[in-house]
C-alpha cells in the first residue's frame, strides 16, 4: 500500500483513567496531510465522534478512560501528497493499585514515571500530562505512599512538585493526581512516579540558561544546508539533558528515517563558575515543511526555539 512502517516503543498504561497519544511524524507539520487512527490493523478507523470512549481528536487518539481490553497495537496513518507513514504503537494496559505497598514500583515503566531527586539539594518532580487541547486539566495534587503531600519543604508549581533540601526519606512511590474535563465529563488522572535519590551533584536547583536561540526566526533559502548552535550555560557537574526537539520529539527520532535533520555532538567549555555547552542542529536540506515550525533547544527545564522563515523576495532580481 506504499506506506512506510514505523514502530514506536511499547507504552505501559494504567487502566481506568484517561490516556492520549499524539501521532507526530514528518511531514505532519503542514496542512496537506491527513491523519487516521486504526486499532489492530482494522480497516475501520477509530471514531472521530467526541462522545465515543475511544476517539480521534485531531492528530491524537484519546481514551476516556483506558480500559483493560484496550491493550493492543494501534496504527496511525499519515498521508501526504507524496508520502505515507504508518506508525505502530503498542499499548499495554495494566491494573495498578498505586497504594499497594507490596509492589515496589513497576518494571518497564516509561522514564517519565521514574524520576531522581538529588540529596541535600532543592529539586523537583514532574507530572507528565500529555493530552489534546480539548482536555482541560485542573490543579495537580501530589501524594507519597498514598498520603497527600503537605509541609513547607514541598511546593506545587504548575506540573512540578518542588522539593527543598531533599533527604533520603524522600525516596519511594509518589503519585500526581489531576481532574481532566472533556465535553463536560470529569475523569481522574493518577500517574505513579517511582522516585529514587542520589548524592551525586545535581544542578543544585539552578536553571540552565539558554544563550541562543532566543525564540527567534532565521531567514533561510529553500534547499540550503543550515547548522544552528544552541548555547547553554549551566553549573558544573549538572545532570541536565541538552537536546533539540520538534513536536516534543527528539529530532533524531523524529527524522529517524530520512536523517535529514540531525542533532550534533554536544561539546562544552569549562569556566570557573559554570560550563558553556553547545549542541547543534543540522538541516541537510531545508524543506518547505520546516518553515514556521518551532525547533526547540531544551536544557533541563529551560527551552528556546528557532523558527525558519523564507527570505523576503528580492525584487532587485526582477
Amino acid at each position: 500500500d506504499g506506506c512506510n512502517d514505523i514502530f514506536m516503543k511499547n507504552e505501559m498504561l494504567s487502566a481506568s483513567q484517561p490516556f492520549a497519544f499524539n501521532c507526530t511524524f514528518p511531514p505532519i507539520t503542514s496542512g496537506e496531510v491527513s491523519v487516521t487512527w486504526y486499532k489492530n490493523s482494522s480497516k475501520i478507523p477509530v471514531s472521530k465522534i467526541i462522545q465515543s470512549r475511544i476517539h480521534q481528536d485531531e492528530t491524537w487518539i484519546l481514551f476516556l478512560p483506558m480500559e483493560w481490553g484496550d491493550s493492543g497495537v494501534y496504527q496511525c496513518v499519515i498521508k501526504g501528497r507524496d508520502s505515507c507513514h504508518r506508525i505502530h504503537v503498542n499499548l499495554t494496559v495494566f491494573e495498578k493499585q498505586w497504594c499497594d505497598t507490596s509492589v515496589k514500583g513497576l518494571p518497564n515503566l516509561s522514564d517519565e514515571y521514574k524520576q531522581i531527586l538529588h540529596l541535600g539539594k532543592d529539586d523537583s518532580l514532574t507530572c507528565h500530562l500529555h493530552f489534546p487541547k480539548s482536555c482541560i486539566l485542573g490543579p495537580i495534587k501530589w501524594y507519597k505512599d498514598c498520603n497527600e503531600i503537605t509541609g513547607e519543604r514541598f511546593t506545587v508549581l504548575e506540573t512540578r512538585l518542588l522539593v527543598s533540601n531533599v533527604s533520603a526519606e524522600d525516596r519511594g512511590n509518589y503519585a500526581c493526581q489531576v481532574i481532566l474535563t472533556h465535553s463536560g465529563k470529569q475523569y481522574e488522572v493518577l500517574n505513579g512516579i517511582t522516585v529514587s535519590i542520589t548524592e551525586r551533584a545535581g544542578y543544585g536547583g539552578s536553571v540552565p540558561k539558554i544563550i541562543y536561540p532566543k525564540n527567534n526566526s532565521i531567514e533561510v533559502q529553500l534547499g540550503t544546508t543550515l547548522i544552528v548552535d544552541c548555547n547553554i550555560t549551566d553549573t558544573k557537574d549538572n545532570t541536565n539533558l541538552r537536546c533539540w526537539r520538534v513536536n516534543n520529539t527528539l529530532v533524531d527520532d523524529y527524522y529517524n528515517e530520512s536523517k535529514r535533520i540531525r542533532e550534533g555532538v554536544e561539546t562544552h567549555a569549562s569556566f570557573r563558575e559554570y560550563n558553556l555547552y553547545t549542541v547543534n542542529i543540522t538541516f541537510l536540506e531545508v524543506k518547505m515543511e520546516d518553515y514556521g515550525l518551532p525547533f526547540m533547544c531544551h536544557a533541563g527545564v529551560s527551552a528556546a526555539y528557532i523558527m525558519l522563515q523564507l527570505p523576503a523576495p528580492d525584487f532587485r532580481a526582477y
Epitope: 522514564d111 541535600g120 522516585v195 545532570t239 554536544e266
Partner: antibody
C-alpha cells in the same frame, strides 16, 4: 532481574585504546546512572565514571583526559573507552548500576567483571 | 578529593569474634556505602546510606557513623564473612573508595 555483562578484548597494547561494552538486560539505560569501576590487581576499587540517563557523563578527574563513556539506547548498551593505556591500567573492569531501595548510589547490580591486561 | 582511609588494612579473626572496621573520610560525608568482595567475584552492595543492610545481608552486620567517621561491625563472625570490605562515599566527586580491609581467618 537486572543483569550487566562486560565484553571487550582482554589484551591491549600500551598507548592503544581500551574499549569495553556493557550490555544491560532487565532495565533501561534511559533511567538512572550507569557506572564503570575498576579493580587493580591486589589493590582497591577505583571509580571511573558514569553516564546518566540523560546522556550526561561524569569522569573521575584522574582519568578525565583519557576516558570517554558513551551509550547506544537502541541496543541498551553503554561503553568505556580509555586512551593511551599503560601497564597501570591493567585491572578488572566492572560495569554497575544502582537503584536498590530507590537509592541510585547503592551499586546493587554489577557485571561479572572483565580482566584487561595492558602488555606489548 | 576526599580521601577514604580504612583501618585496619587487614585483620585476622576467629569465627564468633566481634569485628569492627573503620572508615575515615578526610572531609565530612553525608552517607557511607559498604561493599563486600570475595576473590574472583564482583563486589556486592553490603550496607547503604550508612546503616541500611542490602538484601540478603545477615543481621549480624551493622553500619553506623556520621561526619568523617563510619564503622561496619560484625557481631559474631561467621566463615562466609571472610572477604575484603570497601567503604565508598558519594557526597563529593570524585566518588572515592577506601583501600579495603581484608578479613582473614586466624
Amino acid at each position: 532481574q537486572v543483569q550487566l555483562q562486560e565484553s571487550g578484548p582482554g589484551l591491549v597494547k600500551p598507548s592503544q585504546t581500551l574499549s569495553l561494552t556493557c550490555t544491560v538486560s532487565g532495565a533501561s539505560i534511559t533511567s538512572g546512572y550507569w557506572n564503570w569501576i575498576r579493580n587493580h590487581p591486589g589493590k582497591g576499587l577505583e571509580y571511573i565514571g558514569y553516564i546518566y540517563y540523560s546522556g550526561y557523563t561524569y569522569y573521575n578527574p584522574s582519568l578525565k583526559s583519557r576516558v570517554t563513556i558513551s551509550r547506544d539506547t537502541s541496543k541498551n548498551q553503554y561503553y568505556l573507552k580509555l586512551s593511551s593505556v599503560t601497564a597501570a591500567d591493567t585491572a578488572v573492569y566492572y560495569c554497575a548500576t544502582g537503584g536498590y531501595d530507590y537509592v541510585e548510589d547503592a551499586l546493587y547490580y554489577w557485571g561479572q567483571g572483565t580482566l584487561v591486561t595492558v602488555s606489548s | 578529593d576526599i580521601q577514604m582511609t580504612q583501618s585496619p588494612s587487614s585483620l585476622s579473626a576467629s569465627v564468633g569474634d566481634r569485628v569492627t572496621i573503620t572508615c575515615r573520610a578526610s572531609s565530612n560525608v553525608r552517607y557511607m556505602y559498604w561493599y563486600q568482595q570475595k576473590p574472583g567475584k564482583a563486589p556486592k552492595l553490603w550496607i547503604y546510606l550508612t546503616s541500611n543492610l542490602a538484601s540478603g545481608v545477615p543481621s549480624r552486620f551493622s553500619g553506623s557513623g556520621s561526619g568523617t567517621s563510619y564503622t561496619l561491625t560484625i557481631s559474631s563472625l561467621q566463615p562466609e564473612d571472610f572477604a575484603t570490605y570497601y567503604c565508598q562515599q558519594y557526597t563529593t566527586s570524585p566518588y572515592t573508595f577506601g583501600q579495603g580491609t581484608k578479613l582473614e581467618i586466624k
